[in-house]
């Protein structure tokens, strides 16, 4: 029997063992987070699956993910939201040490999908493990991109107090309007709830002593934020390694000087 014709996309296919991975991650998450221990992971997986299975993978909408978003509702305490752009690893290392702060990937839905790829096919119940749409080469309304746009919007909408964002000072555009942070999160912070956005610009080079808070793209971010009636602050983190070390051991004498 000839295999049924399958759409060829430019991106890599669904991560192997995707359903098992999502379910296992959900169970692990509910075990580690007491406030989530009553969550039915099968229902979460069913809602996740329902967002993209049997649907044309270039025509996914935020509406498709609403049942999942409803099931994944969580609140972050005020002043405890950490956004990031192009510096995921350090942001995650930070929240692993500073346990009372949270990135999107520390929340159930972000944790489930982190580093995974998925897509289905129109009119079949199959998951496509061969290829999935690439954001640039195929379409932006693909299951993965729409998921992150949806959950990022929700994460930003629910933030309150002082929100922090970690930015990569080694990139040509420290603040990139086309990143998820620049295109989604910045515009969905609620001025009624968010008093300020504090940017932490992470330096790459050991001898880099420039004030990257004066970078034109940071000034652009400040302008966007200020126009939204949210105060803006910026800090240089000259030594990310020392920064993490001082989060772990704030009493260390070397932590009294600048980082």
């Amino acid at each position: 029997v000839l295999p049924r014709w399958r759409q060829q996309w430019s991106g890599s296919g669904t991560t192997s063992r995707f359903p098992e991975t999502v379910l296992a991650r959900c169970v692990k998450y509910t075990e580690v987070h007491p406030e989530m221990r009553h969550v039915d992971c099968q229902s979460v997986w069913d809602a996740f699956k329902g967002a993209f299975i049997s649907k044309y993978p270039c025509n996914i909408t935020e509406e498709d993910y609403q049942p999942l978003v409803k099931l994944g509702t969580q609140t972050v305490p005020c002043n405890k939201t950490l956004l990031w752009s192009r510096i995921k690893d350090l942001a995650h290392q930070f929240t692993q040490v500073q346990r009372d702060m949270f990135t999107l990937e520390d929340m159930l839905l972000g944790y489930l999908a982190d580093d995974l790829t998925w897509c289905g096919e129109f009119n079949t119940f199959e998951i496509n493990y061969q290829s999935c749409p690439d954001w640039r080469k195929d379409c932006s309304n693909n299951p993965v991109s729409v998921f992150w746009k949806t959950v990022s919007r929700r994460f930003a909408e629910t933030a309150c107090g002082v929100v922090h964002v970690m930015l990569n000072g080694s990139r040509s555009k420290i603040f990139d309007k086309n990143s998820t942070f620049g295109s989604v999160e910045v515009h969905n912070l609620q001025p009624e709830k968010v008093q300020a956005l504090e940017a932490w610009v992470i330096h790459g080079g050991r001898e880099d002593s420039r004030d990257l808070c004066q970078d034109p793209t940071i000034k652009e971010l400040e302008s966007i934020i200020s126009k939204r009636n949210i105060r803006f602050f910026c800090k240089n983190i000259y030594r990310p390694d020392k920064f993490l070390q001082c989060v772990k051991n704030p009493e260390d004498s070397s932590c009294l000087s600048g980082i």
């Epitope: 007491p34 221990r37 009553h38 039915d40 099968q42 229902s43 099931l71 509702t73």
Partner: antibody
């Protein structure tokens, strides 16, 4: 064998106070989340309070109907769960059950203790 | 305090199959596990089904549970006279941060 034994019920006038106890045995009490559930005469089950294990923060939760009046607490050294009930009302009249969690559901219930609020 | 919705009564003849429904919302049944309890008059509730469909040891396989969306159901096949009791569904509600019980269903074996 897992056992939960409630005590402390009785007749109390409106506005009065009572402290219920639940003595636990046959399982590691320290690790268990615990709940109080009540049942008014001829009515259904109504959740009253839940308390997490200390390792999970010891957080207490209570139904809106008892918030500010009832306090759930635990003494892990005595394997005992408590429910301090103040400002009692006629509608608090019920059999009060203590129940233990098995991770995310209440699997074992005590036989209950009767609280009657009447003048 | 809101409750999960159950029919107040159900009945069947010995050998029959009876189903008891339990409906809620996204913040309880939709998102969280459903558990079922059996209670005979004057006694404490006893766990019958946990996590939607699991049976504790000692519970006959005539009892089964299922869940779909924001509803759950308890099925009893091969009904026996000793099944005459009150049945309650329960689920944690994330909006209330507490347990919700169904109003209870009184099962009569005719």
């Amino acid at each position: 064998e897992v056992q939960l034994l409630e005590s402390g019920g009785g007749l109390v006038p409106p506005g009065g106070s009572l402290r219920l106890s639940c003595a636990a045995s046959g399982f590691t009490f320290t690790n268990a989340w615990m709940s109080w559930v009540r049942q008014a005469p001829g009515k259904g089950l109504e959740w009253v309070s839940t308390i997490r294990s200390k390792t999970d923060g010891g957080t207490p939760y209570s139904a809106d109907s008892v918030k500010g009046r009832f306090t759930i607490s635990r003494d892990d050294s005595k394997n005992t769960l408590y429910l301090q009930m103040n400002s009692l009302r006629a509608e608090d009249t019920a059999v009060y059950y203590c129940a233990k969690y098995d991770y995310n559901y209440m699997d074992v219930w005590g036989q209950g203790t009767t609280v009657t609020v009447s003048s | 305090q809101s409750v999960l919705t159950q029919p107040p009564s159900a009945s069947g003849t010995p050998g029959q199959r009876v189903t008891i429904s339990c409906s809620g919302t996204t913040s309880n049944i939709g998102r969280n596990y459903v558990h079922w309890y059996q209670q005979f008059p004057g006694t404490a509730p006893k766990l019958l089904i946990y996590r939607n469909s699991q049976r504790p040891s000692g519970v006959p396989d005539r009892f089964s549970g299922s869940k779909s969306g924001t509803s759950a159901s308890l099925a009893i096949s091969g009904l026996q006279s000793e099944d005459e009791a009150d049945y309650y569904c329960a689920a944690w509600d994330d909006s209330l941060n507490g347990w919700l019980f169904g109003g209870g269903t009184k099962l009569t074996v005719l």
